[in-house]
């Protein structure tokens, strides 16, 4: 039950996180005009990964896309790439995790297969979250660097801009959305990886004892069963116990391939 809850919660947290990463990537307010020096401006500038916008006090807002690709700073391109990779990985992770959910039955899928898929999606969520956090952090660093520079615009030279007015930019709402969303995706991924351990079949080394009719010696079969090589169906190695309460020692878990994540 706890495993299902952990897996479900991990999925939901990751889903919210990825939705946040998508939202942050699409948002225009990655950087906003710093109003410290001019708090009474009638024109407010803000910029995103894909376009820059100007909101006039009249209420009119005009946005212009960055129609050049080569003219954009390498850092901005890198941030775009990180965010897109994060979204793609997150989306694939969500797709995989849906099929991995313990509460959803798909044919005769084994728990071991679900565990494998849970682990895969968990890793994908972790990488997705890290990509988003890295992307937002790179952009934030770029802003901090540019804030103290005398250049008027962050994207110097882009589109042949004339640098005549000093406009400083500070952190926009998208950065905070991105950081929180990346963190949630990361947490969701960790939860999926934790859930994966609980989903994996217990592969304990029990000594099988067989009792025979009187007059025969008691045969002890050592070795138990070998660790399965994969997550597929492995009925040959499964032991069926017909009754008898297990002691605490018997139910202890032994290292499996999921422990080394």
């Amino acid at each position: 039950m706890a495993v299902t809850a952990c897996q479900g919660l991990g999925f939901v947290v990751s889903l919210i996180g990825i939705a946040g990463i998508i939202a942050a990537t699409c948002m225009d307010q990655w950087s906003t005009q710093d109003l410290y020096n001019n708090p009474v401006t009638a024109v407010f500038n803000y910029q995103g990964l894909w376009r820059s916008c100007v909101r006039e006090s009249s209420g009119f807002t005009e946005c212009r896309g960055y129609f050049t690709l080569l003219g954009l700073p390498a850092m901005l391109q890198a941030v775009r790439a990180l965010m897109i990779v994060g979204i793609v990985l997150g989306a694939i992770g969500l797709l995989v995790s849906i099929f991995a959910l313990k509460c959803i039955r798909i044919g005769s899928m084994e728990d071991s297969a679900k565990a494998n898929m849970t682990l895969t999606s968990g890793i994908m969520f972790i990488v997705s979250g890290l990509c988003a956090i890295a992307g937002v952090s790179v952009f934030a660093n770029m802003l901090v660097t540019n804030f103290w520079m005398s250049t008027a615009n962050m994207y110097t030279g882009m589109g042949g801009m004339v640098q005549t007015v000093q406009t400083r930019y500070t952190f926009g709402a998208a950065l905070f959305v991105g950081w929180v969303a990346g963190g949630l995706t990361l947490i969701g991924g960790v939860m999926m990886c934790i859930a994966c351990r609980g989903l994996a079949p217990e592969e304990t080394n029990y000594k099988a004892v067989s009792y025979h009719a009187s007059g025969h010696s008691v045969a002890y079969k050592p070795g138990g069963f070998k660790a399965s090589t994969g997550f597929g169906s492995n009925t040959k190695n499964k032991k069926i116990y017909d009754g008898g309460a297990r002691t605490e020692d018997e139910v202890q878990s032994y290292p499996s391939k999921h422990d080394y994540v």
């Epitope: 005009q33 001019n38 009474v40 401006t41 009638a42 024109v43 500038n45 803000y46 910029q47 820059s52 916008c53 100007v54 006039e56 006090s57 009249s58 209420g59 009119f60 005009e62 212009r64 008027a152 615009n153 801009m161 004339v162 640098q163 005549t164 007015v165 406009t167």
Partner: antibody, heavy 119, light 113 residues
Amino acid sequence: DVQLVESGGGLVQPGGSLRLSCAASGFTFSSFGMHWVRQAPGKGLEWVAYISSGSGSIYYADTVKGRFTLSRDNPKNTLYLQMNSLRAEDTAVYYCATSYYYGNALEYWGQGTTVTVSS
Amino acid sequence: DVVLTQSPDSLAVSLGERATISCKSSQSLFNVGNQKNYLTWYQQKPGQTPTLLIYWASTRKSGVPDRFSGSGSGTDFTLTISSLQAEDVAVYYCQNVYSYPLTFGGGTKVEIK
């Protein structure tokens, strides 16, 4: 058609108070910033104050700051200018105008209401 | 505050001739974000309310005759009436719409010579 009608002007003694109103129609009043601009007899235009669509931002000219208070009632489509501690130099025709156009330009203007401050 | 200085104070031009009005700002009115200059020109005919002519320093409002044109960037701006008509007799004002307070220039009175 956009219409702005000012009212509330009149003769007032120095130090007195007056409340101007501007009734708007023909556009979504609650979506646009509004301005007051005045013109003293035989003089040029002087911007007085601005209020944003949701009253979140209000700005005043230095000459009226602390004496004039700008407000709006969006459900009633009305703009108000409360003028206190009036001086002789506040004598002017007061226009209300809206930044209905691009570039923060004041496209629509009312016909104006005359305020005379005299003893 | 932004101070706008208009020159000349008055201008007498013959019908059909060019009229040029200058407006100088104490601060740049150029906005880097959209590459636009936040200066507006108004026309006030005798006994009438002001009307908008040009916004963004050079964009004519729809319905304004094309003999009116605005130019300039940063701190220096010009309003040109390419061929003065009788109905153009008015006072012309420039206005800073970049930062509050939204100051006006002193105005230029255009008359027929």
